[in-house]
Interface confidence: low
């Protein structure tokens, strides 16, 4: 903390301008009025202050606003935002999307810092849900943002926000996250026609149940292998050979390269070998011809 010292005669700052870069840290502390700084925060960004000088300016704002900065100041923090700790940010009440954008811009190009994560958390909690505009903004700055949320947090995403999600935003989502997002996407895109619907829903299919995959197989969608490999194993297992053939269309040939990997491996084990042979891909490991297949699922459900 900077020691309290009187401002030398003639050094009192009438405004925030470039002359302040020549002030020593103690002079900034003594000669810059905190209320003046708060009203002229937008000027700070244009002045090449050192990190040490920025520490002093932050200290002055902290003294002026011990309960947390007002949004009028927060919106103009600029590079001073990088000096804030998560503890500082937890005191803020950020409600304007413009404020959020301004601060995210400061951190642009860098990984999400603890400060940014806290800011986003405060903003989203303040809004009560991840609305479309917010999600649009966050994924623009951080494509992986959506997948950094827990399944519980994702449950607060309204289906309308799903329109803001791009395929790359889901790249790092795991199956449990897609389980939450898929039903929302299905709801969001339900009024689209077949081919358009598939384009939109494709990235979310890692959360799709068997009945939806069966329905898609009737729509001539030609799912690619990368998408198929991300499907839930338990959703793929009940599909018949004919359904998988229809689902993949010309991409069905790719099954051969994946025959030892889930979900293809487990699916093969559930198919009759003579059904697999109809694909002409040389897939091996199905149920030998002539074996009786008992469907125990009904018995298990009843016991």
């Amino acid at each position: 903390e900077v020691e309290k010292t009187a401002c030398p005669s003639g050094k009192k700052a009438p405004e925030i301008d470039e002359s302040l870069i020549f002030y020593k840290k103690w002079e900034l502390e003594a000669c810059v009025d905190a209320a003046l700084l708060a009203t002229q925060m937008d000027r700070v960004n244009a002045i090449p202050f050192t990190y040490e000088q920025l520490d002093v300016l932050k200290h002055k704002l902290d003294e002026l606003y011990p309960q947390g900065y007002p949004e009028s100041v927060i919106q103009h923090l600029g590079y001073l935002f990088l000096k804030m700790s998560p503890e500082d940010i937890r005191k803020w009440n950020v409600t304007s999307l413009e404020t959020l954008k301004a601060l995210l811009e400061v951190n642009k190009g860098h990984e999400m810092s603890p400060q940014v994560a806290t800011l986003i958390d405060r903003f989203v909690k303040g809004r009560g849900q991840l609305d479309k505009d917010t999600l649009d903004t966050l994924t623009a700055f951080y494509p992986g943002y959506l997948c950094s949320l827990s399944p519980e947090e994702l449950s607060s995403v309204p289906p309308s926000s799903i329109w803001a999600v791009r395929p790359q935003d889901l790249d790092t989502c795991d199956p449990r996250q897609l389980d939450v997002l898929y039903p929302k996407a299905r709801l969001a895109f339900q009024n689209m026609n077949g081919s358009e619907y598939f384009v939109k829903i494709q990235s979310f299919l890692g959360g799709a149940p068997t009945e939806d995959l069966k329905a898609l197989s009737q729509q001539n969608v030609s799912m690619d292998l990368a998408t198929f490999m991300k499907l839930r194993t338990d959703a793929v297992l009940p599909l018949t050979v004919a359904e998988v053939q229809k689902l993949l269309g010309p991409h069905v040939e790719g099954l051969k390269a994946e025959e030892r990997h889930r979900p293809v491996r487990d699916w093969i084990l559930r198919q009759r070998q003579d059904d697999l042979d109809t694909l002409g891909l040389g897939l091996q490991g199905g149920i030998p011809n002539g074996y009786l297949v008992l469907d125990l699922s009904m018995q298990e459900a009843l016991s």
Partner: antibody, heavy 122, light 110 residues
Framework: QEQLEESGGDLVQPEGSLTLTCKAS?????????ICWVRQAPGKGLEWIGC????????WSASWVNGRFTISRSTSLGTVDLKMTSLTAADTATYFC??????????????WGPGTLVTVSS | AYDMTQTPASVSAAVGGTVTIKCQAS??????LAWYQQKPGQPPKLLIY???TLAPGVSSRFKGSGSGTEFTLTISGVECADAATYYC????????????FGGGTGVVVG
Amino acid sequence: QEQLEESGGDLVQPEGSLTLTCKASGLDFSSSYWICWVRQAPGKGLEWIGCRHTFTANTWSASWVNGRFTISRSTSLGTVDLKMTSLTAADTATYFCARDESNNDGWDFKLWGPGTLVTVSS
Amino acid sequence: AYDMTQTPASVSAAVGGTVTIKCQASQSISNYLAWYQQKPGQPPKLLIYQASTLAPGVSSRFKGSGSGTEFTLTISGVECADAATYYCQQGYTSSNVENVFGGGTGVVVG
């Protein structure tokens, strides 16, 4: 026989960088599974670092990694690399690579390499 | 975050006895939990996955149970070869995670 083997462990100066390589033999690298890195400081527990998908190239990593460690893959060489920067003494550990056995149904690591030792010291 | 807490940190067992190790998740992880055994100088060995499924080649003396946030590994008919450190590992999510492993439990057979 499917096997993983780590290499590249070494004595490195603080603030230095090092790249470890996980070589997968008997595994088809154009197929879908995760290769993960786990480390263990001397006398301590297991610490997950992150994973790279061999097919989609997706990467997941622990929240503490903070960009210091990067996981990359080479399909042609059948390797997954762990590039470590700004190393400190706290990064001294045996580094294991492991294969996630169940791509879709939770994470578990059935196949492990023997490990490679990284020592950070001046 | 999904934090895994293992208890106890160490335990002693007599040959032929039973050992119980507990693992608690800070949030529900369904049944996505694995158990590993590690001996000095060796990599970990998968014992159990999805909370209760025995990995191939693992003795049926090892039993996993639990779901949600509470899990247990039970070793019955303890043998000298069971002396090792045991780790639980959540397999539920990999996003926003500090460490997927629990802190470990050392088992001493005497």
